[in-house]
Interface confidence: low
């Protein structure tokens, strides 16, 4: 960025100036003018381009084409495009003329030294624009956008360290550098110029809190060579020219986008003239590079699974075995959190959300640790944070959280187009209350964080009718082999009553729910006839259906869904303390591993040797090429108001779509 530098020439002695390649310098010839001057001529040595700009209306002209009428509105513009080999090796000569004199009245000479300076992010951002054609002070979204990308260096590459990599001002291991973005300062010009000029790398104190910079000052394979030069308390750094014409810096993010932080960070290099001992150094030129901190991105259940997490607790051996078998079928890794670490807190879905951050050079999985802080609260930090697995959390200052702050209440849709707008990374779905009402909501700090990521704009659904209050209690997504690529599953009391009425008409009214449940206390069976004659249950489920229908309309509108994109899964709810819980295991609360679904075993009415609820679900999902495995979670999960999805978590493959190519 030019500071619109103006150089004043003198008749008494030649003037020297430094100019930057490609940057215009204005030459002021009006400071000392011989008496009687009516015209002037301007010439430059080869490599110096000189233009005259008569006024705003008329474009600039090359100066060496003719003699110019002396007029204080004229601007003389000098540009050099390649760096000098030596100090003052180019010059501009101005001659002042009168119509009465054949020879020039006087000469002024301006000696020029050209230096080329650029500060760039290492633009291996696939397809992002070449720096010569863009305003580097901007960061632009989209396939033809430009600007650098920074990762929050929130993993722990050195297992011997206690903290995340960006928590101090050191590079502890070389692997750490892979999580950083490269920034290059290139300078070309006579070395002698830097005897009385200096280069300063600088940023604002605001940005210094959000990113930090290391300068490589020694052998690349030695950690100590990476000197911390900007960030935290450091806002400027005089750059020693250690490696001739190119200095390399490594930049890491310290903070994710959040309330009050857009994610944009600027670094500047300024060339300062320090030749005059009586004055402070004066700026000649500043170049800027802008980075955007990569957002944390959630992965929908339709993306391929990489790793499944489950807790082993006192009474869930069969459940863990079933999940292990499903993971094996789906070809993904299984991690079991032992009882010593979970202390019988089995709700691993509620404790954390597994997502990722991405730059062109690196993709890093990142766990978002919920503020719920049950007995599993140490698991994400102690067991998931590690080499190439980052960690982030948000907790309200007053520590006040509700059940809605558990991450069973944080989901994301597959990619959608809604109201003409593309959401190539889907939209985050969180549960809250009806607009304008004062019930439970996700804590503000989590909502702020999710909104600030920008790439998956959140939709708030109504969940306060549920006792636990999580979106995964009535909603899930499964992959589908067609253009849409997915179906949304919604829990449906209406569909369940319809199914039971059909079975009753066919003479199966005495078929029993909950037959075969293995539990310490015998679970009471109930027949289809009893369900359909229970007025309270029917009325309550009408209310539940209206709550789900409210969400259905929101989801259709905000995700651009048609009725054919939605599958109604039969489900009944019961009331506890005026809020809803699943009457039988909640079928939509399922584990989706590619085409393999781990669905809570509903223990529905057995008709002709088959559970009619399982049969119905199979008939709805198997035509999509999905394989349904019904997992008995009744005692260890369902009785505690959760199901298969609540008790598992999945790390998934990132989107192939690159977030910087979208336009939020």
């Amino acid at each position: 960025m030019s500071l619109q530098r103006i150089v004043r020439v003198s008749l008494e002695h030649p003037t020297s100036a430094v100019c930057v390649a490609g940057v215009e310098t204005l030459v002021d010839i009006y400071g000392s003018v011989p008496e009687g001057t009516e015209m002037f001529e301007v010439y430059g040595t080869p490599g110096v381009d000189i233009y005259i700009s008569p006024n705003m209306e008329r474009g600039r002209e090359r100066a060496d084409t003719r003699r110019w009428r002396f007029d204080a509105t004229l601007e003389i513009i000098v540009v050099m495009n390649s760096p000098s080999n030596d100090l003052n090796d180019s010059h501009v000569q101005i001659s002042y003329h009168s119509s009465h004199e054949p020879l020039p009245l006087a000469y002024a000479v301006l000696y020029l030294t050209c230096v080329d300076i650029s500060l760039d992010c290492d633009l291996n951002c696939e397809g992002r624009q070449d720096r010569n054609f863009v305003d580097k002070r901007q960061w632009v979204w989209g396939p033809s956008g430009y600007g650098g990308i920074l990762l929050v260096n929130c993993d722990r590459d050195d297992p011997s360290c206690d903290v995340q990599d960006n928590c101090d001002q050191h590079v502890h291991c070389l692997q750490d550098l892979e999580d950083m973005s490269v920034m290059v300062l290139r300078t070309q010009g006579p070395a002698a110029l830097f005897d009385d000029h200096k280069l300063v790398l600088h940023t604002s104190s605001y940005d210094a809190k959000r990113a930090q910079v290391f300068h490589i000052c020694g052998p690349e394979d030695v950690c100590e060579a990476y000197r911390h030069v900007l960030g935290q308390d450091k806002v400027s750094y005089e750059v020693p020219r250690l490696h001739g014409d190119e200095e390399r810096f490594f930049v890491e993010g310290l903070s994710f986008p959040d309330a009050g932080f857009t994610g944009l960070i600027s670094f500047h290099v300024t060339l300062l003239d320090d030749s005059n001992e009586d004055f402070s150094a004066s700026p000649i030129f500043t170049d800027t590079v802008v980075f955007r901190v990569a957002p944390w991105i959630m992965t929908p259940s339709t993306l391929p699974p990489l790793e499944v997490y489950v807790c082993r607790v006192r009474n869930n051996t069969c459940f863990v075995d079933a999940v292990a078998e499903l993971a094996r079928k789906a070809g993904c890794k299984l991690t079991i959190c032992p009882q010593a670490e979970n202390r019988n807190d089995r709700w691993i879905q509620d404790e954390m959300e597994l997502g990722y951050v991405q730059a062109p050079h690196k993709t890093l999985p990142v766990v978002f640790d919920s503020p719920r802080n049950g007995e599993l609260q140490d698991f994400p930090y102690k067991r998931i944070l590690g080499p190439d697995f980052g960690y982030v959390t948000r907790e309200p200052r007053d520590r006040s959280v509700s059940g809605l702050d558990s991450f069973g209440n944080l989901e994301v849709s597959p990619p959608v187009v809604a109201n003409g707008k593309e959401y190539p990374l889907g939209r985050i779905l969180i549960g809250g209350n009806l607009p304008g009402s004062s019930g439970r909501r996700v804590t503000q700090v989590v909502r702020d964080f999710l909104h600030a990521q920008k790439v998956q704009p959140p939709v708030e659904l109504f969940v306060d009718w549920l006792a636990v209050g999580h979106v995964d209690e009535f909603l899930s997504f499964v992959p589908a082999p067609d253009g849409k690529g997915f179906r949304m599953l919604l829990a449906s009391p209406g569909a369940c009553f319809k199914l039971f009425q059909e079975k009753q008409k066919c003479g199966h009214g005495r078929a029993l729910l909950f037959q075969g449940v293995v539990d310490d206390e015998q679970v009471k069976t109930i027949s289809i006839n009893q369900v359909l004659s229970n007025k309270d249950l029917i009325n309550y489920n009408k209310f539940v259906q209206s709550c789900i229908d409210w969400n259905r309309e929101v989801l259709k509108r905000e995700l651009g869904l048609a009725e054919c994109d939605i599958i109604d899964i039969p489900q009944l709810f019961k009331t506890e303390r005026k809020k809803a819980t699943a009457f039988f295991p909640d079928l939509v609360n399922m584990l989706v591993l590619g085409k393999h679904l781990g669905i809570p075993k509903p223990f529905g009415p057995i008709i002709n040797g088959c559970c009619c609820l399982e049969e119905k679900v199979r008939s709805l999902l198997e035509p999509l090429g999905l394989h349904c495995t019904f997992i008995d979670d009744f005692t260890p999960y369902h009785m505690l108001h959760g199901e298969v999805h609540c008790g598992t978590n999945v790390c998934r493959k990132p989107f192939s779509f690159k977030w910087w190519n979208m336009v939020p």
């Epitope: 019988n344 807190d345 004062s438 439970r440 636990v468 303390r577 009785m639 108001h641």
Partner: antibody
Framework: EVQLLESGAEVKKPGSSVKVSCKSS????????VVWVRQAPGQGPEWMGG????????HYAQKFQGRVTITADEDTSTAYMELNSLRSDDTAVYYC????????????WGQGTLVTVSS | EIVLTQSPATLSLSPGQRATLSCGAS???????LAWYQQKPGLAPRLLIY???IRATGIPDRFRGSGSGTDFTLTISGLEPEDFAVYYC??????????FGGGTKVEIK
């Protein structure tokens, strides 16, 4: 409805310990949290801590951290509260109560155990 | 921790009158996790209202809880002789820093 039966009144010397028991009947012990609340003469109730028997993990109010131990025995459906290093200002009625899992909200209360600390 | 301040300390009313008891919190009680208890001499507290406004099982509808954030109210619409007791408010939003108010005594005038 859950019934809670607490152990009998105790008189203790300063510096000693007391262990109060609370036996539950009429409901599934595992399905609730058990909380302990004390009430000094003429004062409002004071929440001491609680335990979810299913998770077997106690939670303590900061004030009592290090001095109180709350345990639960699933086999006998009994919860226990032990308070150490007793002082005269620990003289109070100690109540146990059942609570819903997801919040520590005392719902059904025991009859209370009077603990008197006096030299 | 959240401090709960109840007012007035004592309320002298006649049977049939309306009683209005206040409970102020030093900071917002999230999710309105506030309860009201009634306690008679020598007995354990009895849960009347939870989640600020939901009546517990078996509680007559003359007891009504309202409010949100930092200001909560218990209203007894027509006092019956058995309603004269001490009433405590209780917040359970910030475990394990759970607190009770100092109480309001409702006595016969």
């Amino acid at each position: 409805e859950v019934q809670l039966l607490e152990s009998g009144a105790e008189v203790k010397k300063p510096g000693s310990s007391v262990k109060v028991s609370c036996k539950s009947s009429g409901g599934t012990f595992n399905n609730y949290a058990v909380v302990w609340v004390r009430q000094a003469p003429g004062q409002g109730p004071e929440w001491m801590g609680g335990i979810i028997p299913m998770f077997d993990t106690p939670h303590y109010a900061q004030k009592f951290q290090g001095r109180v131990t709350i345990t639960a025995d699933e086999d006998t459906s009994t919860a226990y509260m032990e308070l150490n290093s007793l002082r005269s200002d620990d003289t109070a009625v100690y109540y146990c109560a059942t609570s819903y899992f997801r919040q520590w909200l005392p719902r059904d209360w025991g009859q209370g155990t009077l603990v008197t600390v006096s030299s | 921790e959240i401090v709960l301040t109840q007012s007035p300390a004592t309320l002298s009313l006649s049977p049939g009158q309306r009683a209005t008891l206040s409970c102020g919190a030093s900071q917002s009680v999230s999710s309105n996790y506030l309860a009201w208890y009634q306690q008679k001499p020598g007995l354990a507290p009895r849960l009347l209202i939870y989640d600020a406004s939901i009546r517990a099982t078996g509680i007559p509808d003359r007891f009504r809880g309202s409010g949100s954030g930092t200001d909560f109210t218990l209203t007894i619409s027509g006092l019956e002789p058995e309603d004269f007791a001490v009433y405590y408010c209780h917040q359970y939003a910030t475990a394990p820093q759970i607190t009770f108010g100092g109480g309001t005594k409702v006595e016969i005038k």
